[in-house]
């Protein structure tokens, strides 16, 4: 049905399927050193890995996409691993008069799914 | 900044970058013929195409991902083309006693972005 349960066990082997992974990045990596003061390094959680058939399907559309990819792989791409939710991050950034704190809601992934 | 503008012109040539495309699918294709009565065919809008640097970035996370992919392509995947919004779809589906109408909100893509 349109509400088939997404698969949660990875058929490709450990660490191969869509999951959250931490990537360390400096302000220089991000091109932010001119406007962000702190933190100097960020532990960025990102979504990586493959999306085999029905693995962590985001919704009905992703289930359809997975099925049609199986039937028409040249025409329909497989679902891909993207954030399902985010962790807010506070950055201390430079202003004309000094520094201020600002919270960014869409910077670091908290969970992943296949969309 | 964290709010750099996403690019909207495709540097790869027409039709190569993330966009909405229509795929025709039958109930049999979807594996739904046992529980859906109508429509017998669906015009499914899906998100296809590549996500070159900063093209249609979904949010700050996608911009970071694009940048880090440029620096560490083996470790950080490029953003990928996924739905940004959906068109609801009404299906006439079989019940024990006959048919009923049900609307699905997450079945057909209406817009795409790179996440």
């Amino acid at each position: 049905s349109a509400h088939a349960h997404p698969r949660d066990s990875c058929p490709l082997g450990p660490g191969r399927c869509c999951h959250l992974e931490t990537v360390q990045a400096t302000l220089e990596d991000l091109g932010w050193s001119d406007w962000v003061l702190s933190p100097r390094q960020l532990q960025l959680s990102m979504c990586v890995g493959e999306c085999p058939h029905l693995y962590r399907s985001a919704n009905t559309h992703a289930q359809i996409k997975a099925r049609l990819h199986g039937l028409q792989p040249d025409k329909v791409p497989a679902p891909c691993c993207v954030p399902s939710s985010y962790t807010p991050v506070v950055l201390m950034h430079r202003t004309d008069s000094g520094v201020s704190l600002q919270t960014y809601d869409d910077l670091v992934a908290r969970g992943c799914h296949c969309a | 900044s964290a709010h750099a503008h996403p690019r909207d012109s495709c540097p790869l040539g027409p039709g190569r970058c993330c966009h909405l495309e229509t795929v025709q699918a039958t109930l049999e294709d979807l594996g739904w013929s046992d529980w859906v009565l109508s429509p017998r065919q669906l015009q499914l809008s899906m998100c296809v195409g590549e996500c070159p640097h900063l093209y249609r970035s979904a949010n700050t996370h996608a911009q970071i991902k694009a940048r880090l992919h440029g620096l560490q392509p083996d470790k950080v995947p490029a953003p990928c083309c996924v739905p940004s919004s959906y068109t609801p779809v009404v299906l006439m589906h079989r019940t024990d006693s006959g048919v009923s109408l049900q609307t699905y909100d997450d079945l057909v893509a209406r817009g795409c972005h790179c996440a």
């Epitope: - | 015009q43 006439m92 609307t103 057909v108």
Partner: antibody, heavy 118, light 107 residues
Framework: QVTLKESGPGILQPSQTLSLTCSFS??????????VGWIRQPSGKGLEWLAN???????YYNSALKSRLTISKDTSNNQVFLKISSVDTADTATYYC??????????WGQGTLVTVSS | DIVMTQSQKFMSTSVGDRVSVTCKAS??????VAWYQQKPGQSPKALIY???YRYSGVPDRFTGSGSGTDFTLTISNVQSEDLAEYFC?????????FGGGTKLEIK
């Protein structure tokens, strides 16, 4: 809960243009597969389909009346409109709008009586 | 245009009886036929979709059958509230067309 309600002028004279409005709730005309149709019924007679409009703005008309009919929609306000030009006494009927899904009419309005009289 | 013919304009039955209302299409319409009930002074109400599928909330004494050109709506164990006119409709092709209706009278 799906509801539809028709409104019209009640009485009009021959050769005038009849303007009908269908206001609905409980569904959206931006939903794939959804449509609204107009059907009329002269007193004591059968049902005659007039026109319909779909979520994607496709429009279909009764071939016998096509030159006189215009259907349109205002999706954001949940309204569908039907205009019938050059009315005659034969257009006297109860006019219904109905939610149309894949060809059939799942829910109907209560109807509005239109009388064409000189 | 496809003509839908309901040859019986009136049918008389008693409470508890079984009655069959028929409808004939002028050409093959597959199973793309619906049935509606219209009680006196009311708007039509959907009963059957795709020739044989009862719409949600419709009592199971209403049954649709047929395909191609011949269709039947059967009401078993007729109740007094079934006093109404019954219409068939084809949606196989435009223009959509209705049958002329069959009025069910309760003795």
């Amino acid at each position: 809960q799906v509801t539809l309600k028709e409104s019209g002028p009640g009485i009009l004279q021959p050769s005038q243009t009849l303007s009908l409005t269908c206001s609905f709730s409980g569904f959206s005309l931006s939903t794939y597969g959804m449509g609204v149709g107009w059907i009329r019924q002269p007193s004591g007679k059968g049902l005659e389909w007039l026109a319909n409009i779909w979520w994607n703005d496709d429009k279909y008309y009764n071939s016998a009346l096509k030159s006189r009919l215009t259907i349109s929609k205002d999706t954001s306000n949940n309204q569908v409109f039907l205009k019938i030009s050059s009315v005659d006494t034969a257009d006297t009927a109860t006019y219904y709008c109905a939610q149309e899904v894949y060809g059939w009419f799942a829910y109907w309005g209560q109807g509005t009586l239109v009388t064409v009289s000189s | 245009d496809i003509v839908m013919t309901q040859s019986q304009k009136f049918m008389s039955t008693s409470v508890g009886d079984r009655v069959s209302v028929t409808c004939k299409a002028s050409q093959n319409v597959g199973t793309n036929v619906a049935w509606y009930q219209q009680k006196p002074g009311q708007s039509p109400k959907a009963l059957i979709y795709s020739a044989s599928y009862r719409y949600s909330g419709v009592p199971d004494r209403f049954t649709g059958s047929g395909s191609g050109t011949d269709f039947t709506l059967t009401i078993s164990n007729v109740q007094s509230e079934d006093l109404a006119e019954y219409f068939c409709q084809q949606y196989n092709s435009y223009p959509l067309t209705f049958g002329g209706g069959t009025k069910l009278e309760i003795k």
